[in-house]
Interface confidence: low
């Protein structure tokens, strides 16, 4: 179920699948819950440790049963990835935090008039992750109003330090706030050149698009299907991004899909879930459980229940099947992706619905003149 | 709201309009989504309109000059006002609106979370209301969604300030000492969100008060914490399945 | 540092039309009401004209209704008043004026700019 | 319309001098109003606001009072940089100046 209640002073023991700096405990959980494998959660305020690079320390991590010790520490904020918490599922994050400078690569720089139109010129450009602003009270007079655009290879500050008279945020383009406008079209039998960011297996490139969408550097992607003519290719998703922030060229091949991250959509951006299953497609995986369920909707509600599992396979074999139920088959892998994808089999695949933000659970933890 | 300021997209993605079409149609109440299928507001708002046909819903919208008729709206399916609503008086203001059609959630429209039952002991410093309401008390109806910082009083000093009106324990009361920040007329229905641990929460809905944003005077809303026994029982049985999980 | 600048002031014949601009530097433009106000030679003070922050609402002084519209562009942190059929008794200097807090009851004017002539003269 | 009436139009008075100025306003504006002083060729500076708030950076002989309909601006003792016009205004519905009081030496 979903669990929203955060630990004070409390620290969870083991389990690290991964560390950023990020400036407060929620922005860690969001990075938790859009984590393929992240369950659990600790953060490290600047005040609750003198160790200079474990300040603003999140750290995300992965327990088999779900839970993992907690240990007391002053000033430390822990709690649980939003995973199952439907529409409290958001990459959106609109806080401004004063007295902090989140630091990454500066690729613009320009004078504003405030941190807010700071943050709007973020959300406005196509590579800005995060920035920082000087105020007007600033010790340099120099720097005074200076709007800082920022991006890092993880999406999240490559440091983070506490330096007054600075304002920082994140921009709000997960908000569908941008007024850059998107590009919805899928473009047939045509791949996109430039550099990869990351590389992933998906069924279609419409799940390829949303893990774009969703990936910190991805501005476009390019698809190869299932009959692309080099079979270790067959499937690939490849994220990629640009110095321009569009595709520098493209090439006319058979058999490739490509498009653009839809995260620069205004007012609507897709569920950061894939809900479709795929008939005659094994997903290979790390086999988490294996359970006798009654068709393929019902194990894609039981993986969307077990809180780590990302993929499915429902085997309708003969030797997989009791009566009416057959074998559902519960996986998960590092990146949330199936680590090989099989046509022609019997059965279905899917992906768990945890992540998607429109499901019912969604719980809430923890005379005069009438107007 | 006097003394807010303009929202923006996506702020308040729980907040929506209730206008009513007759000849004209004009926006009249605010009230919250906390469901798919759920909006809460204030009882009075149906005072001499509780015809259900004549009301239209806006969720995820900022502006109002922005509709047209062609801007999509919820009809509603069934208005639950608390039974013991007395017209008359201001006590147990709310009411439920069943939707005809369950709404999607997006960033810019999903339900705002409801507290615990009973909820006392939570020290809620960081509370706001919205609302398209008055900007004074002679005022109109604002275009942009207005949203105000206001802090929340004991219940003791709003009686203070209320001599002639019992503030029972039901109702919760924010404002300024000085004055200068309330809801008004228009914002009725909506929301007071308190956010604690990260999360934003209904704490009250806006209901009355003296005049909006006089001295000494603060908003009078309604308790939502004190309600969620009835807001369950109400969702629940309306059609055999939990719409909402109550807090654990 | 907060700054208004008026410019387009001049002289016109009556019948005609000008168009004013107000420059604002120094502050969130998009988050406050502006105004306009004229003072005729050797007069007092007379508010012309507001516009809320987001352009959606405007008022007018009923000596200018019809006649002036004004208007906002946020993402150039400019204020404008089209002034058509103009006359004689618009002659002044026209200010352009914001209150600080935002608030819109606290709206008394603690910004000013330093003003530009329009003269309606034949 | 809001009407706003000041008296009187001009006041001559000498430097150390308490002057006071009256603002009449045609309907109650509660307290919804300000006052401003302005040099010959300058633009207005708000010097009171909400009737009695003295703005950031005014001095304390300013001082202001009143509510509904009649307003005052008090001097407490005239210094030489307060000769000016001085002008009442109310924002209770939209916003209405005074004709404003002209404060020259005796």
């Known amino acids: 179920g979903c669990l929203t209640q955060l630990y004070e002073n409390a620290f969870f023991r083991g389990g690290d699948v991964a560390s950023m700096y990020t400036p407060n405990a929620q922005y860690c959980q969001m990075r938790c819950t859009f984590h393929p494998r992240c369950l659990l959660f600790s953060f490290l305020p600047a005040s609750s440790i003198n160790d200079m690079e474990k300040r603003f320390g999140c750290f995300l991590k992965d327990s088999v049963t779900g839970t993992l010790p907690k240990v007391h520490r002053t000033g430390a904020v822990s709690g649980h990835s939003l995973k199952q918490c439907g529409h409290q599922i958001s990459a959106c994050h609109r806080d401004i935090y004063k007295g902090v400078d989140m630091r990454g690569v500066n690729f613009n720089v320009s004078k504003v008039s405030s941190v807010e139109e700071c943050q709007k010129r973020c959300t406005s450009n196509i590579r800005c992750q995060f920035f920082s602003y000087a105020t007007q009270t600033f010790h340099k007079a120099e720097y005074r109003n200076n709007c800082l655009l920022k991006y890092s290879p993880g999406g999240t500050p490559t440091a983070i330090k506490v330096l007054s008279n600075v304002e920082s945020g994140f921009s709000l383009k997960p908000c569908a706030l941008s007024e850059i406008g998107c590009h919805m079209n899928i473009f047939q039998h045509l791949a996109f050149s430039d550099v990869d960011v990351a590389r992933v297996l998906t069924p279609d490139a419409f799940v390829c698009r949303t893990i774009c969408t969703y990936h910190p550097n991805c501005l476009f992607f390019t698809f190869y299907t299932n009959v692309w003519k080099i079979e270790s290719q067959r499937n690939v998703c490849l994220l990629k991004t640009s110095e321009s922030g569009t595709p520098s060229s493209s090439t006319p091949q058979e058999n490739t899909i490509s498009g653009y991250s839809l995260l620069t959509c205004k007012r609507t951006l897709p569920e950061p879930c894939h809900s479709k299953i795929y008939p005659g497609v094994d997903f290979g995986g790390e086999e988490l459980n294996v359970t006798f369920v009654k068709g393929v909707n019902v194990c894609q509600e039981t993986c969307t229940k077990m809180i780590r599992c990302q993929f499915f396979t429902y085997s309708l074999l003969p030797e997989d099947c009791k009566e009416e139920k057959c074998k559902c088959f519960l996986r998960l892998s590092m990146d949330g992706s199936p680590t090989r994808i099989a046509y022609g089999t019997q059965g279905s695949s899917g992906y768990s619905l945890r992540l998607c933000n429109t499901g019912d659970n969604s719980v809430c933890t923890t005379k005069t003149s009438t107007r | 709201i006097v003394g807010g300021t303009n929202s923006s997209w996506g702020e308040w993605p729980w907040q929506v309009s209730l206008q009513v079409k007759l000849t004209a149609q004009r926006h009249l109440c605010g009230g919250s989504l906390i469901g798919h299928q759920w909006v809460l507001t204030a009882a009075h708002c149906f005072d001499g309109l509780p015809l259900q046909d004549v009301w239209r819903i806006y969720s995820g919208i900022l502006n109002l000059s922005d509709i047209t008729k062609d801007t999509p709206f919820s009809q509603i399916k069934e208005i639950i006002i608390h039974q013991n609503y007395k017209v008359s008086e201001g006590n147990h203001d709310i009411a439920l609106i069943k939707l005809q059609a369950p709404l999607n959630y997006t960033e810019f429209q999903k339900p705002i979370c409801l507290p615990s039952k009973g909820d006392t002991s939570t020290i809620y410093t960081n509370c706001w209301v919205t609302g398209w309401g008055f900007s004074k008390e002679k005022g109109e109806i604002q275009n942009i969604l207005q949203k105000v910082n206001i802090p929340l009083v004991t219940n003791e000093e709003c009686q203070k300030r209320y001599q002639d009106y019992k503030i029972t324990q039901r109702m919760v009361c924010a404002g300024y000492k000085e004055g200068g920040k309330d809801a008004c007329k228009g914002d009725s229905g909506g929301p007071l969100v308190c956010k604690h641990n990260g999360m934003w929460r209904l704490v009250g809905i806006t209901s009355w008060g003296e005049g909006c944003a006089r001295r000494e005077q603060p908003g009078v809303y309604t308790k939502v914490a004190e309600y969620m026994d009835w807001i369950l029982e109400k969702t629940q049985s309306s059609d055999g399945k939990a719409q909402m999980q109550s807090p654990a | 540092e907060v700054q208004l600048l008026e410019s387009g002031g001049g002289l016109v014949q009556p019948g005609g039309s000008l168009r004013l601009s107000c420059a604002a530097s120094?502050?969130?433009?998009?988050?406050?009401?502006m105004m306009w106000v004229r003072q005729a030679p050797g007069k007092g003070l007379e508010w012309v004209s507001g516009?809320?922050?987001?352009?959606?609402?405007?008022v007018y002084a009923d000596s200018v209704k019809g006649r002036f519209t004004i208007s906002r562009d946020n993402s150039k942190n400019t204020l404008y008043l089209q002034m058509n059929s103009l006359r004689a008794e618009d002659t002044a200097v026209y200010y352009c004026a914001y209150r600080r807090t935002g608030a819109p009851r606290r709206d008394a004017f603690d910004i000013w700019g330093q003003g530009t002539m329009v003269t309606v003269s034949s | 319309d809001i009407q706003m009436t000041q008296s009187p139009s001009t006041l001559s008075a000498s430097v150390g001098d308490r002057v006071t100025i009256t603002c009449r306003a045609s309907q109650s504006i509660s307290s919804w109003l300000a006052w401003y002083q302005q040099k010959p060729g300058k633009a207005p500076n708000l010097l009171i606001y909400k009737a009695s708030t003295l703005e950031s950076g005014v001095p304390s002989r300013f001082s202001g009072s009143g509510s509904g309909t009649e307003f005052t601006l008090t001097i407490s003792s005239l210094q030489p940089d307060d000769f000016a016009t001085y002008y009442c205004q109310q924002y209770n519905t939209y916003w209405t100046f005074g004709q404003g009081t002209k404060v020259e030496i005796k």
């Open positions: 516009i809320y922050s987001s352009g959606g609402i405007t």
């Open positions: 120094g502050f969130t433009f998009s988050h406050y009401i």
